[in-house]
């Protein structure tokens, strides 16, 4: 039994932990029977052979944030008993082959955030009972084939944020085990045809932030089981017919920041439990019927930040459960009278940012629980009589930025208004823009010099004190459809949400994290 | 610093109405998922609802469908639960929790009000 | 629904010792799991999410792993304070379930 190293501090022997700049190598003696070992924050740069000889009980060994560069193969030797080993956060360029053999029970291997530039397969071919390899934040730029092979145990398996710039079809095939596929932030250009097929019990696999145009028509087929793809950020012009056709355990999808220009019908096949899609940041131009139909169960469809310049009547055809639908920002300068009716449940709709000059009266007929309705800056002059008169929960309403017509035939909508002006909001009002003489006036107290024709003017019902849906102007395009002002750079897309580093990648949602895998 | 604190929580009778309220500070409320989670007396936690960042998009638990109302106020930084229909079964601590959702998976409840106490009884 | 199963439902252990508590998913969750721990009379507090990554702030004697349905939290030496309960949450699909929770108690 050997005492507590003077630089670490021990735990009733079993966990050492030794931190601080002044450590250079690693402290001795270490307690024999010590289970947990944490090297962290030192000016430790190299492992010499055998540092860890005497404590072949370790089963977690932490090695991070140091200025370690060099390991020597046997530095690990007489740790068969070690689950757990991190090297993250380090300097390694290179690892010598054999360091990790003889690690019979190692299930986790932690070597993110390094300078890693190339991995070969006998560095693991020894590592059996793998069952988590971190290897993301590196500089790796391809993967041999092979690498992989021994590791048939695997479930969870991150190399993103490194420079892969195209992935053999082979080089995952042996691992029928992984749960688990991380490729988010590389350079890759295309996936090849069969490169997933043997990931039957895939459950989550992350593409997104990288540079893949086409995607093979059979690319997911064979994962059934895949629960959460991420496809955002990339360069995707078009999706293949029966991409999404057999993944019906789906519920999360990320196809915003492409380059999809069409969406064919019946492209998202059956997917019960997908509730939020998002595609903003496209090049999509119409919507044709049916194109949704398979999403029963969505309740949030982003579509703003396209060039959608036609809504076929039955695009949204299925999507009984939808809550909330966003096509601000987009080419629109009419909709079809019934293209809403199918959206009994819809209570916000963001329509600003479009060219809207006109709309049909019973474009909201059916759709009787509408909350937000978002219709600023179009180019409507007028609407329809009694257009809101039924929506008895509307509770914000936005028309500024439109060039409101004010002549006599204003005046039901101008006297709607008035009774109505809680939901209008405070910050901006609709005005005036012709005649003239009235440019710039508040739509609701213009004097429009014509006697006023006898109108129904509905009664307005209570509202609580706090409206339900408030105005937010700045906050993520993921799930909003009220905001006018929004990110750029999507905050979810692996930063899980472009431009932060991934030790940050909760920031923007105020998520902080230690360790990211 | 980033805080959540409930209230609105008190005695009710069993068929009676109550409204928990969440005031949130220190943090963007309009970037964030919120949620309510509850916690009878000497039990384990039960998810009850949550909501999305805009409000558009909600969910609850089968337990509570029908009778409880997630809504949101991002003017006001505000989160509430509208309790209708209560039953004793209802009776336990309410909290309010900030949902941290991102596009890598990395889901948690990250951040938690101190509770608010709901008592159904007769 | 998924439904979560927590074992043990409580142990007991000493300062000092290596603990492990298993949580088991009905179905596969991916690594969409976060572990929590709670005080009596307070609130939770975060301490692993996506199954394996140590939120910031909290102790490294805690790990986490697993993916799919079977996961672990590991409390490598058990502190005085680490005599609480512990909850492990799935986020992959709703309703969010929680475990029933494992009790760590003094021997």
């Known amino acids: 039994y050997y005492g507590c190293p003077s630089e670490c501090t021990c735990s009733r022997a079993s966990q050492v932990e030794c931190t601080g700049a002044r450590i250079v190598a690693v402290p001795t003696p270490l307690p024999w029977n010590a289970m947990s070992l944490q090297i962290l924050n030192t000016h430790i740069t190299e492992l010499s052979e055998s540092p860890f000889l005497n404590i072949s009980a370790l089963i977690a060994l932490r090695i991070e944030k140091n200025e370690l560069s060099h390991i020597m193969p046997g530095a690990f030797r007489n740790l068969g008993s070690l689950r757990y080993l991190s090297l993250a956060n380090n300097k390694l360029q290179v690892l010598p082959i054999g360091l990790f053999q003889g690690l019979d029970s190692l299930e986790s291997l932690l070597l993110s955030s390094n300078q890693l530039v190339q991995i070969q397969p006998a560095h693991f071919s020894q590592c059996s009972n793998l069952k988590e390899l971190q290897l993301h934040g590196n500089h790796l730029e391809y993967i041999p084939d092979g690498a992989f092979d021994h590791l048939v145990g695997l479930t969870k398996l991150n190399l993103g944020k490194n420079s892969l710039t195209h992935i053999s079809p082979r080089v995952f095939q042996h691992l029928g085990n992984l749960q688990v596929l991380r490729l988010y932030e590389n350079r890759l250009t295309d996936i090849p045809m069969g490169t997933f097929d043997g990931l039957v019990n895939l459950q989550e696999l992350a593409l997104q932030q990288n540079q893949i145009g086409l995607l093979s028509p059979g690319l997911f087929h064979n994962n059934h089981n895949l629960q959460r793809l991420y496809l955002s950020n990339n360069h995707i012009s078009q999706l293949p017919p029966s991409i999404f056709m057999q993944l019906p355990q789906l519920n999360r999808l990320t196809l915003f920041g492409n380059s999809l220009k069409e969406l064919s019908p019946g492209i998202f096949g059956p997917m019960p439990n997908l509730r939020e899609l998002w595609l903003y940041d496209n090049h999509i131009t119409s919507l044709p019927d049916n194109v949704f139909s398979n999403l029963r169960q969505l309740q949030v469809l982003i579509l703003s930040r396209n060039q959608i310049s036609f809504i076929s009547p039955g695009a949204f055809n299925g999507l009984t459960e939808l809550r909330e639908l966003s096509l601000h920002t987009n080419a629109l300068q009419d909709l079809d009278g019934n293209v809403f009716r199918m959206l009994a449940n819809l209570q916000n709709i963001s329509l600003q940012n479009n060219r809207l000059r006109q709309l049909p009266g019973n474009i909201f007929a059916n759709v009787n629980g509408l909350m937000t309705i978002q219709l600023q800056n179009n180019q409507l002059e007028n609407l329809p009589l009694g257009i809101f008169d039924h929506l008895g929960k509307l509770c914000e309403l936005r028309l500024y930025d439109n060039p409101w017509r004010c002549d006599s035939d204003i005046l039901p909508l101008r006297n709607w208004l008035l009774l109505n002006q809680p939901r209008l909001g405070t910050d901006t009002v609709p005005v005036c823009f012709s005649p003239a003489n009235v440019r710039g006036q508040s739509l609701i107290i213009i004097n429009v010099n014509v006697a006023v024709p006898s109108v129904h003017v509905p009664e307005v019902p209570s509202y609580p004190e706090t409206s339900w849906y408030p105005d937010t102007s700045s906050y993520p395009d993921t799930t909003s459809i009220s905001s006018t002002t929004e990110l750029t750079s999507p905050v979810e897309d692996y930063t899980d949400l472009t431009t932060i580093q991934v030790t940050d990648d909760r920031s923007v949602w105020g998520m902080t994290q230690a360790q990211s895998g | 610093q980033v805080q959540l604190v409930e209230s609105g929580g008190g005695l009710v009778k069993p068929g009676g109405s109550l409204r928990l309220s969440c005031a949130a500070s220190g943090f963007t409320f309009s970037d964030y998922y919120m949620s309510w989670i509850r916690q009878a007396p000497r039990k384990g936690l039960e998810w009850v609802s949550s909501i999305s960042n805009s409000g558009g998009a909600i969910y609850y638990a089968d337990s509570v469908k029908g009778r409880f109302s997630i809504s949101r106020d991002n003017a006001k930084n505000s989160l509430y639960l509208q309790m209708n229909s209560l039953r004793a079964e209802d009776t336990a601590v309410y909290y309010c929790?900030?949902?941290?959702?991102?596009?890598?998976?990395?889901?948690?409840?990250?951040?938690w009000g101190q509770g608010t106490m709901v008592t159904v009884s007769s | 629904d998924i439904v979560m199963t927590q074992s043990p439902s409580s142990l007991s252990a000493s300062v000092g010792d290596r603990v492990t508590i298993t949580c088991r998913a009905s179905q596969g969750i991916s690594s969409a799991l976060a572990w929590y721990q709670q005080k009596p009379g307070k609130a939770p507090k975060i301490l692993i999410y996506d199954a394996s990554s140590l939120e910031s702030g909290v102790p490294s004697r805690f790990s986490g792993s697993g993916s799919g349905t079977d996961f672990t939290l590991t409390i490598s030496s058990l502190l005085p304070e680490d005599f609480v309960t512990y909850y492990c949450?799935?986020?992959?699909?709703?309703?969010?379930?929680f475990g029933p929770g494992t009790k760590v108690e003094i021997k």
């Open positions: 949450q799935q986020f992959n699909s709703y309703p969010h379930t």
């Open positions: 929790a900030r949902y941290n959702w991102n596009d890598r998976g990395y889901d948690a409840f990250d951040i």
